[in-house]
């Protein structure tokens, strides 16, 4: 008796839903009375499905209302675990344990990404020096580097600072500021850069005509 996994690594997005799967051999019709399926994430119990009944009493509180075994898949030899509203804390090594005549288990690693998609921006000016402060703020995970470039997409020199804090959902709240001498209609870009391909997000900041503090813009591309 052997359990197999179509994939042993899932990379999922924060807030999305995921379904992870373990396959087991079923000949003809499934005998629910003989089937035991356990899903665990490290020392947390997620699913205990024993002889056709799910025992919710033992389910870890962090998975309550979010995790379910797709029972219609069992007859196909597929023990599929669905988790909704994926959180950063859902990252880790999962295990499906299946007993159906014999017993076996497999591990599945889940990684959770939160792209820095929504970039908030602000521009302010010091009337005494005409120095502009450009600020970009976004939430995501894991750590991102903020890169400032000009309209030619060349790095910009200037005094910069970065602050990072944690949100309630354990995302990283990254705020980067850049102080530069600039004139009206100059264009700057802040890019939240991550090493994985397709994980970079950029906002465009245009120096306004008036030397005043402007409300946050949300233009991104």
């Amino acid at each position: 008796f052997t359990v197999t996994v179509p994939k042993d690594l899932y990379v999922v997005e924060y807030g999305s839903n995921m379904t992870i799967e373990c396959k087991f051999p079923v000949e003809k019709q499934l005998d629910l009375a003989a089937l035991i399926v356990y899903w665990e994430m490290e020392d947390k119990n997620i699913i205990q499905f024993v002889h056709g009944e799910e025992d919710l009493k033992v389910q870890h509180s962090s998975y309550r209302q979010r995790a379910r075994l797709l029972k219609d898949q069992l007859s196909l030899g597929n023990a599929a675990l669905q988790i909704t509203d994926v959180k950063l804390q859902d990252a880790g090594v999962y295990r499906c344990m299946i007993s159906y005549g014999g017993a076996d288990y497999k591990r599945i690693t889940v990684k959770v990404n939160a792209p820095y998609r929504k970039i908030n921006q602000r521009i302010s000016v010091d009337p005494a020096t005409s120095e502009h402060e450009l600020i970009c703020q976004a939430e995501g995970y894991p750590e991102a580097e903020v890169i400032w470039t000009n309209s030619d997409h060349q790095p910009v020199s200037g005094k910069r600072s970065v602050t990072t804090s944690r949100t309630e959902g354990m995302l990283l709240n990254v705020t980067s500021s850049l102080r530069v001498n600039a004139t009206a209609n100059d264009v700057f870009y802040c890019t939240f850069w991550r090493s994985q391909p397709g994980q970079n997000h950029t906002a465009e900041l245009i120096i306004p005509e008036l030397p005043a503090t402007h409300p946050p813009q949300n233009r991104t591309h």
């Epitope: 042993d8 035991i36 356990y38 033992v58 880790g92 344990m97 017993a103 288990y105």
Partner: antibody
Framework: QVQLKESGPGLVAPSQSLSITCTVS????????ISWIRQPPGKGLEWLGA???????NYNSAFMSRLSISKDNSKSQVFLKMNSLQTDDTAIYYC???????????WGQGTSVTVSS | DIQMNQSPSSLSASLGDTITITCHAS??????LSWYQQKPGNIPKLLIY???NLHTGVPSRFSGSGSGTGFTLTISSLQPEDIATYYC?????????FGGGTKLEIK
Amino acid sequence: QVQLKESGPGLVAPSQSLSITCTVSGFSLTSYDISWIRQPPGKGLEWLGAIWTGGGTNYNSAFMSRLSISKDNSKSQVFLKMNSLQTDDTAIYYCVRDPYYYAMDYWGQGTSVTVSS
Amino acid sequence: DIQMNQSPSSLSASLGDTITITCHASQNLNVWLSWYQQKPGNIPKLLIYKASNLHTGVPSRFSGSGSGTGFTLTISSLQPEDIATYYCQQGQSYPRTFGGGTKLEIK
């Protein structure tokens, strides 16, 4: 803190059976697997079998016919039973916490078993 | 069963030396490889889990590397208390299997 403690007979006559109890504290058997490992005098480590959180077991094929592992979650106890012992079963027998996502992180102090008439 | 080939079987080194012990698996282990230290007359203790992660309380002079079928345990700046036998163990599949051990002695 996490502890595992084996209790066994010490001496077993050839062809007789061996029963060892492992009592754990500081964690629950519903959250961690337990493996049994033995070490003959002056030799290396040999994995005998494991019992999973859900009660499923897996045995080293070399011992499958004469080894049985069970547990009582409520008493925090794991039991090893091995039949038909011979002199080459003389060893220190360890119970070990063996989380599937980590490694064998906590070991009992071991119980010495001598098979002799 | 996955065979674990550990070398050398014994090793003599001087205090302050850096030594390496290797473990070769007959099948792909991904990162499911652990290293244990057993001092004379003592129980085995976990040093490294998942190929390269230091277990709590283990000195940083111990390090592990590798993935797939080839793995290495490195001890830098050898100390007298490092005299022990070292074992690798695969956790990729059942039955769990150990390397034959490397007995480390101080010159």
